[in-house]
């Protein structure tokens, strides 16, 4: 079944942008001016998820790349990765659970909770130029709040 999708950028609540760091990693850093063109454009898709009152299930792909953010266990720890997919089959309404994030929207701020690992969130560090990761704490040092901006084609 077709899915609703949109193109957007994400910035953390400290206004750090997300950029590629090697072929399979994202990092967060402050960008200005022309450097803003480096930021990753996501294709966010509305997918099937668990029933909930306030969470909206989405998948986060990289626009025009066959890469999706996914959550897997590595060394017994929930880990965020960029995973290659067959572009002929993605996005789809019934995404595998590792690709699904519960989007939580409060006061124009977004959180992305892993559907596979409840209470684990897409996170950035306070420090500059550090990897985007899956964090198991909210409201601590690490940043779990993001803002979204549509990208005009």
């Amino acid at each position: 079944a077709p899915v609703r999708s949109l193109n957007c950028t994400l910035r953390d609540s400290q206004q750090k942008s997300l950029v590629m760091s090697g072929p399979y990693e994202l990092k967060a850093l402050h960008l200005q001016g022309q450097d803003m063109e480096q930021q990753v454009v996501f294709s966010m898709s509305f997918v099937q998820g668990e029933e909930s009152n306030d969470k909206i299930p989405v998948a986060l792909g990289l626009k025009e790349k066959n890469l999706y953010l996914s959550c897997v266990l590595k060394d017994d720890k929930p880990t965020l990765q960029l995973e290659s997919v067959d572009p002929k089959n993605y996005p789809k309404k019934k995404m595998e659970k590792r690709f699904v994030f519960n989007k939580i929207e409060i006061n124009n701020k977004l959180e992305f909770e892993s559907a596979q690992f409840p209470n684990w969130y897409i996170s950035t560090s306070q420090a500059e130029n550090m990897p985007v990761f899956l964090g198991g704490t909210k409201g601590g040092q690490d940043i779990t709040d993001f803002t979204m901006q549509f990208v005009s084609s």
Epitope: V3, R4, C8, I56, K103, M148, Q149
Partner: antibody, heavy 119, light 108 residues
Framework: EVQLVESGGGLVQPGGSLRLSCTAS????????MAWVRQAPGKGLEWVGI???????YYASWAKGRFTISRDTSKNTVYLQMNSLRAEDTAVYYC?????????????WGQGTLVTVSS | EIVMTQSPSTLSASVGDRVIITCQAS??????LSWYQQKPGKAPKLLIY???TLASGVPSRFSGSGSGAEFTLTISSLQPDDFATYYC??????????FGQGTKLTVK
């Protein structure tokens, strides 16, 4: 205060075209999804379509091809371009803001603008 | 496309009555269902989303329930301000978002 104001409605002949505008205040369209919903006189609500970013628009099956939704973020305005209009397109056209991205429900509505298709 | 069917189409009731309106989807939509109230000449107003969550500022006499393909809107004790037309809406069905045909609530 969040407000949506539609304009551009009026009388148009069958086969004609019309462009409706919806100007938002109190929030930015740079991260808000906007839908158009219409209501023929004495009838129910009918979803027309929705726009996210300028390249991501979705339509009811009956609206595809004739109706186009676009946006101008600098003017904080969304548009509905209607072509090849027919008598059955006569309706009040509302713009509405999706409560949250992909929530599908509409939490803020304009007052509506009446489109009459008649010769 | 998913079709939403409301019943009844019209309903007569008195102030203080308990009123139930039902909405049926042609296939399962989990809890992706909203309810709206519309008064003549006015824009619709969101009452309930995700089948059972009350929208901001909506009185607690309104409640929603259901999941899958069967949903209900209940007004526990009808007030004079509640006479209006009510619409259900499927909010999760792929790329298209469908409304029910409406239920007009009138004074008995």
């Amino acid at each position: 205060e969040v407000q949506l104001v539609e304009s551009g409605g009026g009388l148009v002949q069958p086969g004609g075209s019309l462009r409706l505008s919806c100007t938002a205040s109190g929030f930015s369209l740079s991260s808000a999804a906007m839908a158009w919903v219409r209501q023929a006189p004495g009838k129910g609500l009918e979803w027309v379509g929705i726009i996210y970013d300028s390249a991501s628009t979705y339509y009811a099956s009956w609206a595809k091809g004739r109706f186009t939704i676009s946006r101008d973020t600098s003017k904080n305005t969304v548009y509905l371009q209607m072509n090849s209009l027919r008598a059955e397109d006569t309706a009040v056209y509302y713009c509405a803001r999706e409560r949250q991205i992909f929530s599908g429900d509409m939490a803020g509505w304009g007052q509506g603008t009446l489109v009459t298709v008649s010769s | 496309e998913i079709v939403m069917t409301q019943s009844p189409s019209t309903l007569s009731a008195s102030v203080g009555d308990r009123v139930i309106i039902t909405c049926q989807a042609s296939q399962s939509i989990d809890n992706w269902l909203s309810w709206y109230q519309q008064k003549p000449g006015k824009a619709p107003k969101l009452l309930i989303y995700r089948a059972s969550t009350l929208a901001s500022g909506v009185p607690s006499r309104f409640s929603g329930s259901g999941s899958g393909a069967e949903f209900t809107l209940t007004i526990s004790s009808l007030q004079p301000d509640d006479f209006a037309t009510y619409y259900c809406q499927n909010t999760g069905g792929g790329v298209s978002i469908a409304f029910g045909q409406g239920t007009k609530l009138t004074v008995k």
